[in-house]
């Protein structure tokens, strides 16, 4: 299976982790498949939910991926750029806040360049709850870690927000920074940032970004 | 903005027509634009929208019958169709990106109609 | 069509001066609306969405505020480089409307 898209096709519509393989390649990756949001199909490739993993690593990290597919995970860079450049995916970000609230964004076309390209990200097509304005900068930035620093800025956005993200200078958001638990999630300019849903500072309950192949 | 690049104004007699472009960057696709207005030392006046596919469109009342919008997605381009020019009409012409309030804008094309 | 009744038309400040711009909409315009900057030649810049959002790389100086048919922009230590004229937006209905705009001008 390339996708959780594949996985649901055949038949398994079980929420849970699989193993997912490109077309024309060896290389496997465990993946969590979310069966049930939204009529299922969904291949999550970021979840953050209490901090128990560390998002500031290295470029390599944030290629291959790392942490727990059934908790808090990346799921890496090059396997998406490969998968997203192969047909046209959406991309669902969900989002979660201290008081209970739930927002989404979801982009109607999204897909990574290759590593060459700094994993640069394309986006179109925002609707959602989440914002009227992309809180990804558009047009998409390149990727940037800790040791890689690609961003517009004359700073450093990974190291001074932590976390690899698509930092403008350095712009509306940042998924993978500090976890800040609760009460202590306000006026933290290097936490998990949306910025057109919970405005400067707010730094979020819990994320997870999810694509499938438009049209399934 | 490079991203959004009006061109096709220019002089043109009362009576007579105009056809205005707008190049879009390819990230534009699926969002409505927007055309805008503004005649020389006056205020915004918005003209129509269109939508992604095009099946929705907005017209401002007051240019009904006189300007058509439209747009070509493989070309990126989103057109204002100008018939019936009247010296009033004379105004800098901008295409944006229309979420209800307009965040991308281009640089604008000046359109004067006089004989 | 819902018109836009913006005030001051124009405003003489100095710097560091508080700016505020009203804008008051002939109905009831649930926070739809927006606030442009716009210097000359160049097009409007968004500020202010949905009343009180502010666009993330505008400074913080710059704030919006309001309800129902009632809605102001405050710019709280005017700086050289704002000197420009403003427009509030409607976007609740078709057809879409502005102010006539504030003109703010160095005392």
């Known amino acids: 299976f390339r996708d959780c898209a594949e996985v649901f096709k055949s038949g398994h519509t079980t929420n849970g982790v699989y193993t997912l393989t490109l077309p024309n390649s060896t290389e496997e990756v465990k993946a969590y498949c979310d069966m049930e949001a939204g009529g299922g199909g969904w291949t999550i490739i970021q979840r953050r939910e209490d901090g128990s993993v560390d998002f500031q690593r290295t470029w390599k990290e944030y290629k291959v991926g790392f942490g727990n597919p059934s908790g808090e995970y990346w799921l890496g860079n090059e396997f998406v750029s490969q998968l997203t450049n192969q047909q046209r995916y959406v991309l669902k970000i969900h989002l979660k806040d201290w008081e209970g609230n739930e927002a989404y964004s979801l982009y109607e076309h999204f897909y990574l360049s290759s590593e060459e390209l700094n994993y640069r990200i394309h986006l179109k097509g925002l609707t959602g709850t989440a914002g009227k304005i992309s809180s990804i900068s558009q047009p998409g930035n390149d990727f940037s870690t800790k040791d890689a620093d690609n961003d517009k800025c004359i700073c450093k956005c990974s190291q001074m927000l932590t976390g690899g993200w698509w930092f403008d200078a350095c712009g509306p958001s940042n998924l993978n920074g500090m976890y800040y638990p609760q009460r202590q999630n306000t006026n933290k300019f290097n936490g998990i940032k949306w910025y057109y849903w919970k405005g400067s500072g707010y730094s979020l309950k819990g994320t997870t970004m999810m694509i499938r192949p438009a049209g399934f | 903005s490079e991203h959004l690049v009006e061109s096709g104004g220019g002089l043109v007699k009362p009576g007579g027509s105009l056809r205005l472009s707008c190049a879009t960057a390819d990230f534009f696709e699926y969002d409505d634009m927007s055309w805008v207005r503004q005649a020389p030392g006056k205020g915004l006046e918005w003209v129509g929208s269109?939508?992604?596919?095009?099946?929705?469109?907005y017209l401002n009342t007051k240019f009904i019958g006189r300007f058509t919008i439209s747009r070509d997605d493989s070309k990126n381009t989103l057109y204002l169709q100008m018939n019936s020019l009247r010296a009033e009409d004379t105004a800098v012409y901008y295409c944006?990106?229309?979420?209800?309030?307009?965040?991308?804008w281009g640089q604008g094309t000046l359109v004067t109609v006089s004989s | 069509a819902i018109y836009m009744h913006q005030e001051p038309s124009s405003l003489s400040a100095s710097v560091g001066d508080r700016v505020t711009i009203t804008c008051h909409g002939s109905y009831w315009l649930n926070s739809e609306v927006a606030w442009y900057q716009q210097k000359p030649g160049k097009a409007p810049k968004l500020l202010i969405f949905d009343g009180d959002f502010k666009v993330y790389e505008v400074p913080s100086r710059f704030s919006g505020s309001g309800s129902h048919e009632d809605y102001t922009l405050t710019i709280s230590s005017l700086q050289p480089e704002d000197f420009a004229t403003y427009y509030c937006q409607q976007y609740r209905y078709h057809p879409y409307t502005f102010g006539h705009g504030t003109k703010v001008e160095i005392k």
């Open positions: 944006a990106r229309d979420v209800g309030f307009f965040d991308w």
């Open positions: 269109i939508s992604p596919k095009g099946d929705h469109k």
